[in-house]
């Protein structure tokens, strides 16, 4: 969370940004809020990126002005126009790529004053893991798969019964490069699992942490997955 103050004579407004993460190959959002101003025509929003000449996006007088936009962002950016009057200056970014990572500035000017705040935008790939029972193995094992991660994550197993146990000796993790030569498929197999236990497969990099849980009993298999973005 970054709060910036701007001073214009005696007038300043608070601009707030949040460290954001973008999943490559999807649309992303760079979050920025400011003190609302009911005079939409008096609001100017500028998004800038460190190291890039020209603007990422500009919104003023109630509409987009893309005349100064850098080529890298052409056709890819939008503000949530209907939410600007309530203080939302967040930027939507289409088809996030690794090269979109970096430091962005959200600059705001309203009839009350002006202000800005920086935002660190991280890009990578993250996906939900799916755990299945591998009945083909000589002893019952669990297979945890997640289709796309970048940078390469760490994978750890845990169990409800054996809390604190180290499963690195009884698991095997592999990373397979996907066809676009950036992201990787994560596969981790845990051997010698026991019935009536809940196992967790945790995949984590500096952008996201995903956990898949599986409870195996004699009568059923229950699964649950969750994904959490870090530092956002």
């Amino acid at each position: 969370l970054i709060i910036g103050f701007g001073i214009s004579g005696k007038h300043f407004i608070t601009v707030t940004t949040f460290t954001s993460a973008g999943n490559i190959g999807e649309d992303g959002t760079l979050s920025c809020t400011f003190e609302p101003d009911i005079k939409l025509n008096g609001i100017v929003i500028q998004w800038l990126k460190e190291g890039i000449k020209g603007l990422v996006h500009e919104f003023k007088e109630g509409k987009d002005d893309l005349s100064q936009q850098h080529e890298m962002f052409r056709g890819r950016t939008a503000v949530f126009a209907d939410q600007v009057v309530v203080g939302n200056a967040s930027l939507r970014l289409k088809n996030v790529q690794l090269t979109d990572a970096g430091t962005y500035t959200c600059y705001i000017r309203t009839s009350k004053g002006k202000g800005n705040a920086n935002l660190e935008y991280k890009t990578g790939a993250f996906s939900m893991p799916e755990i299945n029972v591998d009945y083909n193995a000589s002893s019952e094992s669990l297979r945890c798969e997640a289709p796309r991660w970048f940078p390469q994550p760490t994978v750890a197993w845990a169990s409800q019964v054996d809390q604190g146990a180290n499963f690195s000796e009884v698991s095997n993790t592999s990373f397979e490069l996907n066809s676009e030569n950036v992201t990787m498929k994560v596969v981790s197999v845990l051997y010698n699992v026991t019935i009536n236990n809940t196992y967790s497969c945790m995949i984590e990099n500096d952008i996201a942490k995903a956990t898949g849980d599986i409870k195996v009993t004699d009568s059923e298999v229950k699964r649950r997955s969750q994904l959490q973005l870090l530092n956002s």
């Epitope: 649309d27 056709g75 950016t77 289409k94 796309r148 066809s179 676009e180």
Partner: antibody, heavy 116, light 109 residues
Framework: EVQLVESGGGLIQPGGSLRLSCAAS????????MNWVRQAPGKGLEWVSV???????DSADSVKGRFTISRDNSKNTLYLQMNSLRAEDTAVYYC??????????WGQGTTVTVSS | EIVLTQSPGTLSLSPGERATLSCRAS???????LAWYQQKPGQAPRLLIY???SRATGIPDRFSGSGSGTDFTLTISRLEPEDFAVYYC??????????FGQGTKLEIK
Amino acid sequence: EVQLVESGGGLIQPGGSLRLSCAASGFIVSRNYMNWVRQAPGKGLEWVSVIYGSGRTDSADSVKGRFTISRDNSKNTLYLQMNSLRAEDTAVYYCARDADYGLDVWGQGTTVTVSS
Amino acid sequence: EIVLTQSPGTLSLSPGERATLSCRASQSVSSSYLAWYQQKPGQAPRLLIYGASSRATGIPDRFSGSGSGTDFTLTISRLEPEDFAVYYCQQYGSSPLYTFGQGTKLEIK
């Protein structure tokens, strides 16, 4: 040369299934948002489905639960599995690439006719 | 759902004349996400304009796009015989993800 070639269209009875294919050359399908767009006879363009670079998918309400978009990265090919087909699904189906600058590459289209 | 309404439905002009096609959105559309396409009978659509005003690769400079918010315009400065076709505007980003206008037919007077 950047190109998309659709196939798999034909005449099918209501309630039937069909799978359309779209073979891409000159670019990598999985790096782009890939779409299916259809056009009923004498009508305008209607978006059907998208598969994002990430592999996530989305579809128009009119086909949700019946049509499934997918891709085979190793074959650089896009698919549209169409189930429970209705007469109103009769159209020319186009696959189209969205390379951030709008739908910049289109296939020639494949015709699907749903009739008994 | 954002609805794009194109006008006129049909535009009758002669070669050499200026054509102005309108696309009005039911709510604000980002200029970045507004595109125009040309479609001739029996052919696939062709991207003309993206980002409301940027010409796609290989598109002649007689085609230009403008507008923002809810009102967008495609202008053909001097009509050539090959320009007579159907034109569609399209927006990206809301639900449904892609929306097309109903089209404007540009015909020879």
